[in-house]
């Protein structure tokens, strides 16, 4: 005998209390597939979450993050505070990158400037809190009299971070 519940379309549920009649999902709930015995509660976008797509009887609500936050996790399950470029997020809030480090994103952490000398090159453009240094030709490649900017830069060997 075929289960009559399989005839219930998305947006309804098979109501066992009413002889397996297909009943519409109650307000603030949905069923995205047919044949379901219950409807799922709609996701609510509260606090740092904002509604990207309203819930309907056949699909869940979709959230993203309010301005100043970015999404993490599948379907934006988490919101993390943005910082400015040149900063990183700590528990005490956004902090400027230490000298010799940079962050070119509004999220994430600061990382050290490239040490051009490890590749036998010189610094063509100084690093900032927001940008890495730009390495140029090796000092030996420069024509006589030409100068290159070489500020002190922390070593950037794998496994060593600025302290």
């Amino acid at each position: 005998i075929q289960d009559s519940c399989s005839n219930c379309p998305a947006g309804t549920f098979c109501d066992n209390n009413r002889s397996q009649i297909c009943s519409p999902c109650p307000p603030n709930s949905f069923s995205s597939a047919g044949g379901q015995r219950t409807c799922d509660i709609c996701r609510q976008c509260k606090g740092v979450f904002r509604t990207r797509k309203e819930c309907s009887s056949t699909s869940n609500a979709e959230c993203d993050c309010i301005s100043g936050f970015h999404c993490l996790g599948a379907g934006c399950t988490m919101c993390e505070q943005d910082c400015k470029q040149g900063q990183e997020l700590t528990k005490k809030g956004c902090k400027d990158c230490c000298f010799g480090t940079f962050n070119d994103q509004k999220r994430g952490i600061c990382r050290p400037w490239t040490n051009c000398s490890l590749d036998g090159k010189s610094v063509l453009v100084n690093g900032t809190k927001e940008r890495d240094v730009v390495c140029g030709p090796s000092p030996a490649d420069l024509s006589p009299g030409a100068s290159s900017v070489t500020p002190p830069a922390p070593a950037r060997e794998p496994g060593h971070s600025p302290q």
Epitope: L72, G73, A74, T77, M78, E80, T90, K91, Q105, G108, I109, R111, P112, T114, D132, R156, P158, G159, S161, Q163
Partner: antibody, heavy 116, light 109 residues
Amino acid sequence: QVQLVQSGAEVKKPGESLKISCKGSGYSFSTYWISWVRQMPGKGLEWMGKIYPGDSYTNYSPSFQGQVTISADKSISTAYLQWSSLKASDTAMYYCARGYGIFDYWGQGTLVTVSS
Amino acid sequence: DIELTQPPSVSVAPGQTARISCSGDNIGDQYAHWYQQKPGQAPVVVIYQDKNRPSGIPERFSGSNSGNTATLTISGTQAEDEADYYCSTYTFVGFTTVFGGGTKLTVLG
């Protein structure tokens, strides 16, 4: 959608080398840190190190410094974990995960078995 | 590096409250995160940044963090909550992530 897909299980002998991979898709691979996490049989999670694929900057846990090498090829959205000489004690499940503090996406894990 | 210590196991009756501690020097100065891992699966975030619950994680999960202890609390524990739980923190000294040793939560009955 965001996915991290790891290479398949490996069975190796002590002293052999190995490189396992983690391919990211569905997001800007270059601009998110990738971490590697070890889980030995029946044991807990251990953070090994991380890489920023945009410029391949790496940072290791002191426990794993010099024991493994983490690398990435941003052109193919793939991070790697490699050993030059495996030991029996390297037998474990290895996960890649997106992030440096909050790990919001994880690979399915690569089981590495080292046995003579 | 900071070391995070968790009890190896915690048992709780269904419907009761489970508390899992994670202790480490001044962990309250850093964000603590909590992961749930079920057998054969990758870990999943259940609490991030001390007390925030990802959407899709039941309201019975909550977290706190101050001084030397972070705590994961599961109110009205259900059988499906049986799993291993790990705390973690990112430390700006050494720029490393550290996991606690993990706690096996057993739901009795």
